[in-house]
Interface confidence: low
């Protein structure tokens, strides 16, 4: 199709070579007067559309993305051509940074239903550069955490080294929706709830004498609870003795609850005490059986192929540990009577 009628937008992605980061392009279709696809509700200057970008189709996946090869070859369909670029509804996700992402990206509706729709497309010229500004050593991360229940803020990585006074007007999006009131390089959250989690995009305009560009950065925001102040607790076994049948196989399960830690290195292991000797047992891998915002329950089993008389003299000890401390629970086997 002829892309000469597409509206054009220039974007700049300056990525940090120190961190993994993502990037997004929105299919921000314009408003031809008679196109149902690109139609936007008529808004007074004070109103804000519910969705920006792309409000036309009921099904937001009804757009097609293409890349325009620099050598003049025909347009290439993004869906099949680029493994690190994923289309999610009307958004194009770039999963890895790199100058090879530079180029022209075109989006348009999949279904052309009227002659007016033919020109209903956007051409985005994306320039990708590695960050060279070494003076800003502590620029905000592209992965930011907010502590639930407290005050927090989300900083625009490309502007975090500028003071609020110097900062240009910023346009923020959360999960593809315009955050209309936010205009500064930092979003302040009075009280953090789990719904503050998501993908935030900050845009600002940079101009030179020739043209203007939209500088964009993407921030993945995670809402977290504070690191636990407690050592893990053992939920099972509860009893310190266990009735068993000699000669039969036996599985003893150790289940422990670990509180949330940002750097999470849980330890859960079984060892055996026999008079003065003590040794760790080779047992199946631990597995997480429940994971919530605040804690994780991890289980690890010890398996005896056959309970022997010797096992009755031993203590089976489950040991669990996090960065705060450790807990143990021992089990003595007792032969079942009659």
């Amino acid at each position: 199709f002829n892309i000469s009628g597409c509206s054009t937008k220039k974007l700049l992605w300056t990525y940090s070579t120190r961190s993994e980061e993502e990037f997004v392009l929105f299919c921000d279709l314009p408003e031809p007067q008679k196109s149902h696809f690109c139609h936007r509700n008529r808004l007074s200057p004070k109103q804000v559309p519910e969705h920006l970008p792309f409000m036309g189709s009921n099904d937001l996946s009804d757009v097609q993305w293409y890349q325009q090869p620099s050598n003049g070859d025909p347009l290439e369909d993004i869906r099949k051509s680029y493994p690190h670029i994923i289309q999610d509804k009307c958004t194009l996700h770039f999963l890895t940074p790199g100058v090879n992402n530079s180029g022209s990206y075109i989006c348009r509706p999949k279904m052309i239903k009227s002659p007016y729709d033919v020109a209903c497309c956007v051409k985005m010229i994306l320039e990708v550069k590695p960050q060279t500004n070494a003076s800003c050593e502590y620029s905000a991360s592209h992965k930011q955490d907010l502590l639930l229940g407290s005050t927090g803020s989300i900083s625009c990585p490309s502007l975090s080294c500028q003071s609020d006074a110097q900062s240009p007007a910023v346009t923020w999006y959360k999960n593809g929706k315009l955050l209309s009131v936010e205009r500064s390089n930092r979003i302040v959250v009075d009280e953090v709830y789990d719904y503050h989690q998501g993908t935030y995009v900050c845009d600002y305009t940079q101009s030179d004498t020739v043209s203007s560009w939209t500088v964009r950065a993407v921030v993945q925001v995670r809402t977290i609870v504070g690191d636990t102040k407690l050592k893990p607790d053992i939920l099972d076994p509860v009893e310190d003795t266990l009735e068993v049948e000699l000669g039969k196989p036996l599985t003893i399960s150790c289940k422990a609850r670990f509180g949330f830690e940002r750097v999470f290195n849980p330890v859960i292991k079984w060892y055996i005490k026999d008079s003065d000797l003590e040794w760790e047992v080779s047992v199946p891998e631990a597995k997480s059986i429940k994971s919530t915002l605040k804690d994780e329950i991890i289980e690890r089993n010890i398996i005896l192929e056959k309970v022997t008389q010797r096992d009755l003299r031993r203590k089976f000890v489950c040991f669990v540990q996090n960065s705060i401390g450790n807990t143990t629970q021992s089990v003595q086997l007792k032969e079942k009577r009659g």
Partner: antibody
């Protein structure tokens, strides 16, 4: 490498989850598919989970299977198995080739056998 | 859903000879070429032979050749070896992922 586990004998209607454990590569970079093969029959494509966790299923498999993943595993849940679901279930990595534009199942696990019987 | 119909099984081939297996799709595969071929031996997982209708996968001998476009594809094995005795499957990738499918398979018997 890719390895499936969790296959066993189940009764009809008992949900079963198969796990595909990967090593040597990251699930952040590859899509993963599930394929099955009934005894003595051909291969059937079940579905794929891509790098941003979007799942796509063969039209016959929608509602019957659920694919999900963690950082190193991909699960296939058979929601309500019937005797027709008796098969070897394979997990395969979807590779992308730079010189073409499509995904192909290049690395396969040995498979895990599921038997659904009363 | 798309249906991929393969040459009926079994197909016989003599050592040193040539064998061709066809695969017909009920609709065009994506970009007319997103079709791959696999070889499977009993008790083993499938092995990728060809992707993109005609590109040879890494480590596959050049005796295997893929051709075709759109809805009609062929796998040709020349200078057939005993080790080529297996079942061969085609697999189509379509613009809608829910259409992706395998063919029914063709068993090649080497005499």
């Amino acid at each position: 490498s890719v390895e499936e586990s969790g296959g066993r004998l189940v009764t009809p209607g008992t949900p079963l989850t198969l796990t595909c454990t990967v090593s040597g590569f990251s699930l952040n970079n590859y899509g993963m598919t599930w394929v099955r093969q009934a005894p003595g029959k051909g291969l059937e494509w079940i579905g794929i989970i891509n790098i941003i966790d979007n799942t796509y299923y063969a039209s016959w498999a929608k509602g019957r299977f659920t694919i999900s993943k963690t950082s190193t595993t991909v699960d296939l849940k058979i929601t309500s198995p019937t005797t027709e679901d008796t098969a070897t279930y394979f997990c395969a990595r979807a590779d992308y080739y730079p010189d073409t534009t499509g995904w192909y199942l290049n690395i396969w696990g040995p498979g895990t056998l599921v038997t659904v019987s009363l | 859903a798309a249906v991929l119909t393969q040459t009926p099984s079994p197909v016989s081939a003599a050592v040193g000879g040539t064998v061709s297996i066809s695969c017909q799709s009920s609709k065009s595969v994506y970009n007319n070429k997103w079709l791959s071929w696999f070889q499977q031996k009993p008790g083993q997982p499938p092995k990728l032979l060809i992707y993109g209708a005609f590109t040879l996968a890494s480590g596959v001998p050049s005796r295997f050749r893929g051709s075709g476009s759109g809805t009609q594809f062929t796998l040709t094995i020349s200078d057939v070896q005993c080790d080529d005795a297996a079942t061969y499957y085609c697999a189509g990738d379509y613009s809608s992922n829910s259409d992706d499918a395998f063919g029914g398979g063709t068993e090649v018997v080497v005499k």
